[in-house]
């Protein structure tokens, strides 16, 4: 639009002046005036600001508390926050990853559809007909029943979703 109907994108209005915002990684020390420019200062160690801003204080980097099962995935900079993830075998309880819980195991009769990551839990699925799982595991998929035929054996005991079939020798034909 012409003429302008607001301050420019990286500016803010204060005391009739359109002042420059501080760039990411810096905080506001003093507003611009008719005589002076906006004064900004870099954020300190372990602090950040991730947007153009007029904040007088930088934000503290997130602390990845090992007591909560957390570890640093990506170290923060003056422009970005620290990113936490969970220790091996654990996953975040929320998107913000403020604490961790142990990966769930899939009970017998269920197999792992998707192995857990640092941010998502194990996904289990019931073993369909022809498959079984006889252990509680965070890694094991449903296994197919043993094929007795390929071993020249016969099914002696039918399989379930928790047990494999039991194979045995074929009955001898009587004379």
């Amino acid at each position: 639009p012409e003429p302008p109907t607001a301050c420019r994108e990286k500016q803010y209005l204060i005391n009739s002046q359109c002042c420059s915002l501080c760039q990411p990684g810096q905080k506001l020390v003093s507003d611009c005036t008719e005589f002076t420019e906006t004064e900004c200062l870099p954020c300190g160690e372990s602090e950040f600001l991730d947007t153009w801003n007029r904040e007088t204080h930088c934000h503290q980097h997130k602390y990845c508390d090992p007591n909560l099962g957390l570890r640093v995935q990506q170290k923060g900079t003056s422009e970005t926050d620290t990113i936490c993830t969970c220790e091996e075998g654990w996953h975040c309880t929320s998107e913000a990853c403020e604490s961790c819980v142990l990966h769930r195991s899939c009970s017998p009769g269920f197999g792992v559809k998707q192995i857990a990551t640092g941010v998502s839990d194990t996904i289990c699925e019931p073993c369909p007909v022809g498959f079984f799982s006889n252990v509680s595991s965070a890694f094991e998929k449903c296994h197919p029943w043993t094929s007795c035929e390929t071993k020249d054996l016969v099914v002696q005991q039918a399989g379930t979703n928790k047990t494999d079939v039991v194979c045995g020798p074929q009955d001898r034909l009587r004379a």
Epitope: E2, P3, P4, C7, R8, E9, C18, Q23, E37, T38
Partner: antibody
Framework: QVQLVQSGAEVKKPGASVKVSCKAS????????MYWVRQAPGQGLEWMGW????????TYAQKFQGRVTMTRDTSISTAYMELSRLRSDDTAVYYC??????????????????WGQGTLVTVSS | DIQLTQSPSFLSASVGDRVTITCRAS??????LAWYQQKPGKAPKLLIY???TLQSGVPSRFSGSGSGTEFTLTISSLQPEDFATYYC?????????FGQGTKVEIK
């Protein structure tokens, strides 16, 4: 303090291109629009257009459309104005100027509060 | 494009004189007008913006007035350092045009 320092004088042949630089210091470069104005010898001032240093988006005066390119490098707080297919009547001093905006009576009033020292571009065969 | 016509184009005056320069716009521009001073071989310097607001650091002998199509720049008591060329600029409609200039010379 705010300073806009431009590149040195250039002599070019008709049909050639020239690229003038304008290095800003003393303020947040991406926070203020940068304008280009030229002045032919003994003549008045002519507005050429502007660039938003944050996004890099330029706006050109109709007269220069197709011949002028305004760019910037935020890493070195420098704006550039390139004029192509030069003619003898492009001989002029080229200025960069920073926009300031004042708010009063419900309106936003722009003006050019800081200017570069000027770059003389001479086009001669 | 909006045309700005300054009058006079040349002006001879003495130190201490009150000087008035007029700038007329070809159409209404509200208060979107600035005044600049330019000395030979130098870049223009902002004096007045929003038609009547004095730029910081500019002596109070300079003043601006007007709105719509007619504007004036007044120097209440001309000083030796004021001998220069003065330009008005409209910032209402692109392209942001300038007046042709008024040269203030020593009488």
């Amino acid at each position: 303090q705010v300073q806009l320092v431009q590149s040195g004088a250039e002599v070019k042949k008709p049909g050639a291109s020239v690229k003038v630089s304008c290095k800003a210091s003393g303020y947040t470069f991406a926070g203020y629009y940068m304008y280009w104005v030229r002045q032919a010898p003994g003549q008045g001032l002519e507005w050429m257009g502007w660039i938003n240093p944050d996004s890099g988006a330029p706006t050109y005066a109709q007269k220069f459309q197709g011949r002028v390119t305004m760019t910037r490098d935020t890493s070195i707080s420098t704006a550039y104005m390139e004029l192509s297919r030069l003619r003898s009547d492009d001989t002029a001093v080229y200025y960069c100027a920073r926009e300031k905006i004042y708010y009063g009576s419900g309106n936003y009033y722009p003006s050019f509060d800081y200017w570069g020292q000027g770059t003389l571009v001479t086009v001669s065969s | 494009d909006i045309q700005l016509t300054q009058s006079p184009s040349f002006l001879s005056a003495s130190v201490g004189d009150r000087v008035t320069i007029t700038c007329r716009a070809s159409q209404g521009i509200s208060s979107y007008l600035a005044w600049y001073q330019q000395k030979p071989g130098k870049a223009p310097k902002l004096l007045i913006y929003a038609a009547s607001t004095l730029q910081s650091g500019v002596p109070s002998r300079f003043s601006g007035s007007g709105s719509g199509t007619e504007f004036t720049l007044t120097i209440s008591s001309l000083q030796p350092e004021d001998f220069a060329t003065y330009y008005c600029q409209q910032l209402f409609s692109y392209p942001w045009t300038f007046g042709q200039g008024t040269k203030v010379e020593i009488k």
